[in-house]
């Protein structure tokens, strides 16, 4: 489906007609005439084809969060445990097992 496709190619649908199409997580560099990795520019350059990828990259570094490709934003796993996507499985399953969440013994 289109959603699955977008999960696998987060920036794939962002490519403009003026640019050459590049593999996932890459952008077209007109000066070099080749596709370049988005990772190289995430910290210092604005590149529209990499915007979603760069945000997802920084989001992955935050514990208990995942990058939602439909919302194009970093979402907290805590708010959706129970109907969570696979990216939150580790967080939500650990949360469930954690004794902190058990009711206090009387």
């Amino acid at each position: 489906s289109r959603v699955d496709q977008e999960e696998r190619f987060p920036q794939g649908l962002w490519t403009g007609v003026a640019m050459r199409s590049c593999p996932e997580e890459q952008y077209w560099d007109p000066l070099l005439g080749t596709c370049m990795s988005c990772k190289t520019i995430c910290n210092h350059q604005s590149q529209r084809t990499c915007a979603a990828f760069c945000r997802s990259l920084s989001c992955r570094k935050e514990q208990g969060k995942f990058y939602d490709h439909l919302l194009r934003d970093c979402i907290s796993c805590a708010s959706i445990c129970g109907q969570h996507p696979k990216q939150c499985a580790y967080f939500c399953e650990n949360k469930l097992r954690s004794p902190v969440n058990l009711p206090p013994e009387l």
Epitope: S1, R2, V3, E6, L13, W14, G16, S46, Q47, R48, A51, R55, D68, L70, L71, R72, D73, I75, S76, S79, I80, Q83, H84, P85
Partner: antibody
Framework: EVQLQQSGPELVKPGASVKISCKTS????????MHWVKQSHGKSLEWIGG????????SNNQKFKGKATLTVDKSSSTAYMDFRSLTSEDSAVYYC???????????WGQGTLVTVSA | DIVMTQSHKFMSTSVGDRVSITCKAS??????VAWYQQKPGQSPKLLIY???TRHTGVPDRFTGSGSGTDYTLTITSVQAEDLTLYYC?????????FGGGTKLEIK
């Protein structure tokens, strides 16, 4: 044909809550995020937040945190926005809006006018 | 948050004229700009996205351009039905923000 049908106008008292609905048709509800946008009389557009219908995760404008709660009912392909502790500042037209394959609003509901008055 | 500034709240024009509505972003939004038209009592309608791509069914007299922080919506030959409100919108990063709007009026 993609359609977003919103609930009718609301006249509410200060301090009360209101729940606006946005019934969708013409597309697969779970494949797109649904967003809500506020437009005060004679003013510009303000993004409130959006929801992913698959798991109910939300992306919010901090300004509306604690004020708006977004939910969905997948069985009826309907999105809802709960707006609480209403004041005169909340009197506005509220739109549900769906973006397409890219993050801009290609489809809009007809708007719901909310009037907060004692 | 990215602030979108439409410096002209009102712009005067005549039918048949060419008019350009401008919008400035507070940071580089890498052509992630959309333009909407809103007629009185109606919902906003998407005209342009990715700064220059015309939405389906939008007449070719509407053209978008720009890059970096500066963006323009141009109507090459203004029609009577175009005399209404226009908003720019950045779809680069959340929170998604809109310009204050520019109203096209008859000269």
């Amino acid at each position: 044909e993609v359609q977003l049908q919103q609930s009718g106008p609301e006249l509410v008292k200060p301090g009360a809550s209101v729940k606006i609905s946005c019934k969708t048709s013409g597309y697969t509800f779970t494949e797109y995020a649904m967003h809500w946008v506020k437009q005060s009389h004679g003013k510009s557009l303000e993004w409130i937040g959006g929801i992913n219908p698959n798991h109910g995760g939300t992306s919010n404008n901090q300004k509306f945190k604690g004020k708006a709660t977004l939910t969905v009912d997948k069985s009826s392909s309907t999105a809802y926005m709960d707006f609480r502790s209403l004041t005169s500042e909340d009197s506005a037209v509220y739109y549900c809006a769906r973006w397409g394959t890219d993050p801009f609003f290609a489809y809009w509901g007809q708007g719901t006018l909310v009037t907060v008055s004692a | 948050d990215i602030v979108m500034t439409q410096s002209h709240k009102f712009m005067s024009t005549s039918v048949g004229d060419r008019v350009s509505i401008t919008c400035k972003a507070s940071q580089d939004v890498s052509t992630a700009v959309a333009w909407y038209q809103q007629k009185p009592g109606q919902s906003p309608k998407l005209l342009i996205y990715w700064a220059s791509t015309r939405h389906t069914g939008v007449p070719d007299r509407f053209t978008g351009s720009g890059s970096g922080t500066d963006y323009t919506l141009t109507i090459t030959s203004v029609q009577a039905e175009d005399l209404t409100l226009y908003y720019c919108h950045q779809h680069y990063a959340p929170p998604w923000t809109f310009g204050g709007g520019t109203k096209l009026e008859i000269k």
